[in-house]
Interface confidence: low
């Protein structure tokens, strides 16, 4: 007896995280002995949608014309062939930003740091949230969480970085959300650009060095050290 | 100060079409989700549909083969049109706006309601 | 669809008492979930939303909890102007499906 169908492949695009109002196509991809595909939700009634195949049969489109808080979530989706129905396919998060208005990202004691000394970029929201992501640009794990314990809600969220080396320079932005969806985030804040300026023993890379390659340091998720803020905040990082 | 009121017809003959508009005074259309709900007299509330000022549209799927939500964002109003009418949807009509999450800080419930418009229907 | 069923459908308290009303859903949805009250003769009012966000301008003898499938309204000290029908609502994915309402009255 043949095994379990393989299980598909879903993806969005123009990618997951999209702002509030754009379009966002889910794709499902299966084999070409594919009847059928479904896009499951979570917390949803299933099926959440149902598509035939695309010619050759091997994926199906799923278009949300306009992002709202109702699509952002979990997704998954299966296919079903003559012989039954697919494993489920590796889950998507669907995020939203706009949901919330824009944070205010800040370093101190100022975004032009020395390598090897500290810097704070603070990321402060109008209104309490309890959920605060800091995301660099080009890095392949962006998302620095501080969450808060026990639902209490903050106006600010610090993440602390020592010491400073040449690859903690970028630019960032940041977030913010409330616990009880992490799949619905505020508008980014306005970027901030760290510059970190070299020693003679440190010198600071060139615009060549710092962008992204497959093995290079940007790479590696951020991992700011230092202690944790008095602000009832925890760290997480994904 | 948003406000939302209903206006309409409040006598719809059977096999007819039901046509309602909510006015949105006070403030914008744009950024929340604009409901349509209904309740039959001394009966409880049923959700009919929403519009988001997109015009993305998500209805009840009991109704939704007789529903239609609509937005005119330059009059700042919506509208409900329910065909084929009976006498089971007679009702007193209410148009909601649901509290988005921009700075509302409803997060999601129905925070502003219009005062409901009574459509009987008879011949 | 995710159904919502309320319970009690109709209960009567004497002024004072601690006033629970539960609410369950069919299916989880986290904490999509917000609690209306209408008055007779009068519009439904927003209470609560995120299970236990209270509205501004309600008063705190009114709270929620809950979260997945299970999810209570609670009155600390019952008042005389308490007196309508609650409702509760589950608005985590569309339809917005309500629950069939409790009716509140006092002994």
């Known amino acids: 007896q043949a095994g379990p169908l393989p299980k598909p492949t879903l993806w969005a695009e123009p990618g997951s995280v999209i702002s509030w109002g754009n379009s966002v196509t889910i794709w499902c991809q299966g084999t070409l002995e594919a009847r059928e595909y479904r896009l499951d939700k979570e917390e949803s009634p299933a099926p959440w949608d149902r598509q035939n195949p695309l010619e050759p049969k091997n994926k199906a489109r799923f278009s949300i014309p306009s992002m709202t808080e109702d699509y952002a979530g979990r997704y998954r989706c299966y296919y079903r062939s003559p012989v039954g129905w697919s494993q489920p396919s590796d889950p998507l998060e669907l995020v939203m930003t706009g949901a919330y208005s824009k944070p205010t990202l800040s370093a101190l004691p100022s975004p032009l740091v020395t390598s090897g000394k500290s810097v704070t970029l603070l990321c402060q929201s109008r209104s309490p949230m309890d959920t605060f992501l800091l995301i660099k640009e080009r890095a392949a794990h962006p998302l620095l969480h501080l969450r808060s314990e026990h639902g209490a809600q903050q106006h600010q969220a610090e993440f602390p970085m020592s010491p400073v080396t040449s690859v903690h320079g970028g630019t960032y932005r940041c977030f913010s959300s409330h616990g009880f969806s992490h799949y619905l985030l505020s508008h980014p804040s306005d970027p901030l650009e760290l510059i970190v300026s070299g020693s003679l023993e440190d010198p600071r890379p060139s615009p060549t060095r710092s962008v992204s390659t497959a093995a290079g340091p940007e790479d590696q998720p951020l991992m700011p050290t230092g202690s944790v803020p008095h602000s009832g905040l925890r760290r997480h990082w994904e | 100060q948003v406000q939302l009121q209903e206006s309409g017809p409040g006598l719809v003959n059977p096999s007819k079409t039901l046509s309602l508009t909510c006015t949105v005074s006070g403030g914008s259309i744009s950024s929340y989700f604009w409901s349509w709900i209904r309740q039959p007299p001394g009966k409880g509330l049923e959700w009919i549909g929403y519009?988001?000022?997109?015009?993305?549209?998500n209805y009840n799927p009991s109704l939704k083969s007789r529903v239609t939500i609509s937005v005119d964002t330059s009059k700042n109003h919506f509208s409900l049109k329910l065909s084929s009418v009976t006498a089971a949807d007679t009702a007193v009509y209410y148009c909601?706006?649901?509290?988005?999450?921009?700075?509302?800080?409803?997060?999601?419930?129905?925070?502003?309601w219009g005062q409901g418009t009574t459509v009987t229907v008879s011949s | 669809d995710i159904q919502m069923t309320q319970s009690p459908s109709s209960l009567s308290a004497s002024v004072g008492d601690r006033v629970t009303i539960t609410c369950r859903a069919s299916?989880?949805?986290?904490?999509?979930l917000a609690w209306y009250q209408q008055k007779p003769g009068k519009v439904p009012k927003l209470l609560i939303s995120a299970a236990s966000t209270l509205q501004s301008g309600v008063p705190s003898r009114f709270s929620g909890s809950g979260s997945g499938t299970d999810f209570t309204l609670t009155i600390s000290s019952l008042q005389p102007e308490d007196v309508a029908t609650y409702y509760c609502q589950k608005y985590n994915s569309a339809p917005w499906t309500f629950g069939q309402g409790t009716k509140l009255e006092i002994k």
């Open positions: 299916q989880g949805i986290s904490n999509y």
């Open positions: 519009i988001y000022d997109s015009g993305s549209t």
């Open positions: 909601a706006r649901r509290g988005g999450y921009y700075g509302s800080g409803s997060y999601g419930g129905m925070d502003v």
